[in-house]
Amino acid sequence: ILGGREAEAHARPYMASVQVNGEHLCGGVLVAEQWVLSAAHCLEDAADGKVQVLLGAHSLSQPEPSKRLYDVLRAVPHPDSRPDTIDHDLLLLQLSEKATLGPAVRPLPWQRVDRDVEPGTLCDVAGWGIVSHAGRRPDRLQHVLLPVLDRATCNRRTHHDGAITQRMMCAESNRRDSCKGDSGGPLVCGGVLEGVVTSGSRVCGNRKKPGIYTRVASYAAWIDSVLA
């Protein structure tokens, strides 16, 4: 997260760290007791490593009573996701067992009504992604509030030049932005999960390259079918 600040500890109990061989790779969001939603491209970066999900964490390194690392029983990328595009960049991870719920671990309600968030709405994005252009990684969870950007502006040639489909949404990126390592994490508007950070090689913090988020409401049928 660029231009953000440290989150209040455990105030986002849905927040997950998707890890490979014990290292944070991507963000994720607990959407059901045994399921974490993340970004499909995160799996590509995992190669053949052991994928696990950390729940109940604020610090990645320090011991915390609520922290628990779960093995992944099943990884289900969206069937239409492709390595060369950010389309359908969603991944569902089934935990090896149901998460132990509590004040620091709780699923987040996700948007099912397929309607665009009003431009200008302030939404919260959180993650353990880099906090500087130099690539400094935080130990503790960071967050930032970002205004939603209308799709027409996001589709301008100097922004994302028509690449933003109706299944995506954008947020402003003027110094405050999601960045590398935040992919798969939640964009939360009004206490509801609206978007998932896409995992492209996008430049961060440049206002002409807004953050791109996969709209979960557009994938309600797929999410329901996997969770069923």
Epitope: N155, G162, A163
Partner: antibody
């Protein structure tokens, strides 16, 4: 299929105004800016301005400020350009184009002829 | 405004020949975001322009690979490796990095 259907040719008198339209189909109208260009006979293209269909915010080439006014009607997925105080210099083909990707989609053009 | 100067004004070619069109901008057209918004359009008689190349060298979908774009800073080139009859028309370069966006004066590709 993306289509931009422009209104038909206009013959107008000097000093008058004209409003030409560009109706979009095959995509969600509010997802892309609409741009307008002018092409005088045998000449190159000039960018007039663009408009955000969500809120009607328009940007103009300084050269066309006071000459062109861009508007949209979301309910009919139509962009409009009004040209006022017309002179023979304004006789040209006017194109609308969708921005994104680049100017990949254009209307067929509207010929405006200013003549007494 | 950024002036886009195209040469030549007219380019007579034989079918099957290679054609090369030059476009020079009066200032650098590298955008503040790092990208260069230089595009090439082909306008056939009585038609609207068609996008061929965007961001200097990227072919738009459906554009044959005989079209290629290159260049940087202020100097750009469009090459057609083997001219076909359907390639005839007026070619325009365009910069979208600075406001107002501007087109070159055009190069007419015609049969020799």
């Amino acid at each position: 299929e993306v289509q931009l259907q422009q209104s038909g040719p206009e013959l107008v008198k000097p000093g008058a105004s004209v409003k030409i339209s560009c109706k979009a189909s095959g995509y969600t109208f509010t997802d892309y800016y609409k741009n307008w260009m002018r092409q005088r006979h045998g000449e190159s293209l000039e960018w007039i301005g663009d408009i955000n269909p969500n809120n009607g915010d328009a940007n103009y080439n300084q050269k066309f400020k006071g000459k062109a006014t861009l508007t949209v009607d979301k309910s009919s997925s139509t962009a409009y350009m009004e040209l006022r105080s017309l002179t023979s210099e304004d006789s040209a083909v006017y194109f609308c184009a969708r921005e994104g990707p680049s100017f990949a989609y254009w209307g067929h053009g509207t010929l405006v002829t200013v003549s007494a | 405004d950024v002036l886009m100067t195209q040469t030549p004004l007219s380019l007579p070619v034989s079918l099957g020949d290679q054609a090369s069109i030059s476009c020079r901008s009066s200032q650098t057209i590298v955008h503040s975001n790092g990208d260069t918004y230089l595009e090439w359009y082909l306008q056939k008689p009585g038609q609207s322009p068609n996008l061929l190349i965007y961001k200097v060298s990227n072919r738009f979908s459906g554009v044959p690979d005989r079209f290629s774009g290159s260049g940087s800073g202020t100097d750009f080139t469009l090459k057609i490796s083997r001219v076909e009859a359907e390639d005839l028309g007026v070619y325009y370069c365009f910069q979208g990095s600075h406001v107002p966006p501007t087109f070159g004066g055009g190069t007419k590709l015609e049969i020799k």
